[in-house]
Interface confidence: medium
Amino acid sequence: GVFNYETETTSVIPAARLFKAFILDGDNLFPKVAPQAISSVENIEGNGGPGTIKKISFPEGFPFKYVKDRVDEVDHTNFKYNYSVIEGGPIGDTLEKISNEIKIVATPDGGSILKISNKYHTKGDHEVKAEQVKASKEMGETLLRAVESYLLAHSDAYN
């Protein structure tokens, strides 16, 4: 089956700048600003566009060693990024893949709202564990806040 979870979170960073840093340069930024969450991001194939495969490795002590993500869509105009988790981590006997959409929407106050949709494609009748969804949400929040802090501290970066 397919289980769809949607989340919103706010950021004080303008949409265009956040998209540039958090989405387009996350591979470089995440290990730098959140080494406690991501130890490395390696480009396996592709140039960052659709079809690109990335290997994200986690630090010692994490329940998973790595995941492989596939880039599905990068929309620079609407600040939208679609990718799928296709290997490693929770992918296995019960879970086929996780399709994710991140959309960054500008807010009138100059900040932005991130709209995140996660579709868990399970095998057969298996359900998604709430803890798994919560852990994924917390990881996303950790990365976002780390990038946000970096951008607030480096006003000249990603403008």
Epitope: Y5, E6, T7, T10, K115, S117, K137
Partner: antibody, heavy 120, light 107 residues
Framework: QVQLVESGGGVVQPGRSLTVSCAAS????????MHWVRQAPGKGLEWVAI????????FYADSVKGRFAISRDNSKNTLYLQLNSLRAEDTALYYC?????????????WGQGVLVTVSS | DIQVTQSPSSLSASVGDRVTITCRAS??????LAWFRQKPGKAPRSLIY???SLQSGVPSRFSGSGSGTNFTLTIRSLLPEDFATYYC?????????FGRGTKVEVK
């Protein structure tokens, strides 16, 4: 199961204030965004306001911005809507509603509504 | 603000009919659209979210489709309890906005 019970409605004069409440049970209230949606007699649904699970963000419909205030007390599992500077066009059934999953942003489970009538 | 235009405003149908209701958003809302059914004197009930995901416990005769600006709710084979008013809601941005509703009446 999810239960939302609104209270505090009634007849109020134009220009006056009123606070309606929504008592929540059957779920972890502090995990979910909450909405107010209203429906004027014989009319369609109008989204009024949302407050995030931790009270960190509030958003309002243009028609009520600056007049209505949404708030919550997570220790009491209660959602509030303070209606100020009331107008005849605010007469409606006011529903409180819970988000579907943490912070998805749309009303999923609804109460039965509380009627607010603005009349002199 | 995003405007949501729902059509038709009302329609007449019989039990067993296939019914289609459409909503059009004034700008791209991706898949951030939900559908609700409201019976007279009752609170609305969520049917579909994310344009096409069926809410838990909702019968499979209901389906949703679309993305971007054009969306459709289809009721495959109308049952007596389906005579009600249906609303769509965009939740791509604030303020959230509902369509004006479609009343499905008995022919």
């Amino acid at each position: 199961q999810v239960q939302l019970v609104e209270s505090g409605g009634g007849v109020v004069q134009p220009g006056r204030s009123l606070t309606v409440s929504c008592a929540a049970s059957g779920f972890t209230f502090s995990d979910y965004n909450m909405h107010w949606v209203r429906q004027a007699p014989g009319k369609g649904l109008e989204w009024v306001a949302i407050i995030w699970y931790d009270g960190s963000n509030e958003f309002y419909a243009d028609s009520v911005k600056g007049r209505f205030a949404i708030s919550r007390d997570n220790s009491k599992n209660t959602l509030y809507l303070q209606l100020n500077s009331l107008r005849a066009e605010d007469t409606a059934l006011y529903y409180c509603a819970r988000d579907n999953f943490h912070t998805s942003g749309y009303p999923w489970s609804w109460g039965q509504g509380v009627l607010v009538t603005v009349s002199s | 603000d995003i405007q949501v235009t729902q059509s038709p405003s009302s329609l007449s149908a019989s039990v067993g009919d296939r019914v289609t209701i459409t909503c059009r958003a004034s700008q791209d809302i991706s898949s951030y659209l939900a559908w609700f059914r409201q019976k007279p004197g009752k609170a609305p009930r969520s049917l579909i979210y994310a344009a096409s995901s069926l809410q838990s416990g909702v019968p499979s005769r209901f389906s949703g489709s679309g993305s971007g600006t054009n969306f459709t709710l289809t009721i495959r084979s109308l049952l007596p309890e389906d005579f009600a008013t249906y609303y769509c809601l965009q939740y791509n941005s604030y303020p959230r906005t509902f369509g004006r509703g479609t009343k499905v009446e008995v022919k």
